[in-house]
Interface confidence: medium
């Protein structure tokens, strides 16, 4: 089938005191090969500081996955989610507050 770019959504949730968990979700993409990783100051974090979900079919002939990491509250601006899919890439910031969800459909 043709390439379908992912919808990327970054959320944040409270973790332990002074920390938050930031999660980057990519959904509705095809084919299934994708790079999704957290970056600090532009460089990728190591695998052992991130948690990945499996790349799973979402029932519409496309796929979804996620990556999460824990960061210090107040340092959100240093972190971005980097996505690469079918030769295209995009970078997504951490939203500034709990109620904010950033959606970005990459074209």
């Amino acid at each position: 089938g043709s390439t379908v770019p992912p919808m990327v959504n970054v959320t944040r949730s409270e973790a332990s005191e002074g920390n938050i968990t930031v999660t980057c979700r990519a959904s509705s993409f095809y084919p299934r090969n994708i790079i999704l990783t957290w970056r600090q100051d532009g460089v990728s974090l190591s695998h052992d500081t991130q948690q990945w979900g499996d790349v799973l079919p979402d029932g519409n002939g496309t796929y979804q996955t996620w990556v999460a990491t824990r960061i210090c509250r107040g340092e959100e601006q240093r972190f971005t989610c980097y996505m690469e899919h079918s030769g295209n890439h995009s970078t997504h910031p951490v939203p500034s507050g709990n109620s904010h969800h950033h959606h970005h459909h990459h074209h």
Epitope: T37, R39, Q40, V43, S46, Q77, T91
Partner: antibody, heavy 122, light 112 residues
Amino acid sequence: QGQMQQSGAELVKPGASVKLSCKTSGFTFSDNYISWLKQKPGQSLEWIAWIYAGTGGTSYNQKFTAKAQLTVDTSSSTAYMQFSSLTTEDSAIYYCARHDYYGTSGAWFAYWGQGTLVTVSA
Amino acid sequence: DVLMTQTPLSLPVSLGDQASLSCRSSQNIVHINGNTYLEWYLQKPGQSPKLLIYKVSNRFSGVPDRFSGSGSGTDFTLKISRVEAEDLGVYYCFQGSHVPWTFGGGTKVEIK
């Protein structure tokens, strides 16, 4: 590699502000992190802050948080640094520099502008 | 902040000599991702600095192979195997592992 062309020398009075520019060409501006650095005559370098052109996100050296403000104009592929409440201690050459990242492989200041001399004098 | 200390302050050399520059950090500069972001820059009089070495030992594009970087933890070295006239200037080490990123005070390589 591309080019990074900085604005010309500035002579400013104490207490004033100055806005320096760094116009880029030859690379995809929005994919890049741009840092600003300070060098006083005959001294070493200090990192001031970076800005990610793709989102406008910034990270500052705490020493400069009240002094510097970084912005970008993606339409003209230009990065700016506004320096406020200037004192003679701010007299220096200010450089912009582009990071060169790929994954965990990083070169922080791979490509530099030519520098802008700021002189603060009454 | 991580303090970067360079020695010597000045290094007089003869052209063709080997030069060895030292850089010591006040704490371990391994990044959270496991890499050590230690870089070396050369600044010639009246010019902007130029990147020579990144990630301790990797030569940046266009940098001659007479430049080599080594070290780990807190102790790092830049070696120039045969100094040429174009190598004269001030060398700075830099750490990009911990914010705020910091430079050493510099080593001036000059003709003996």
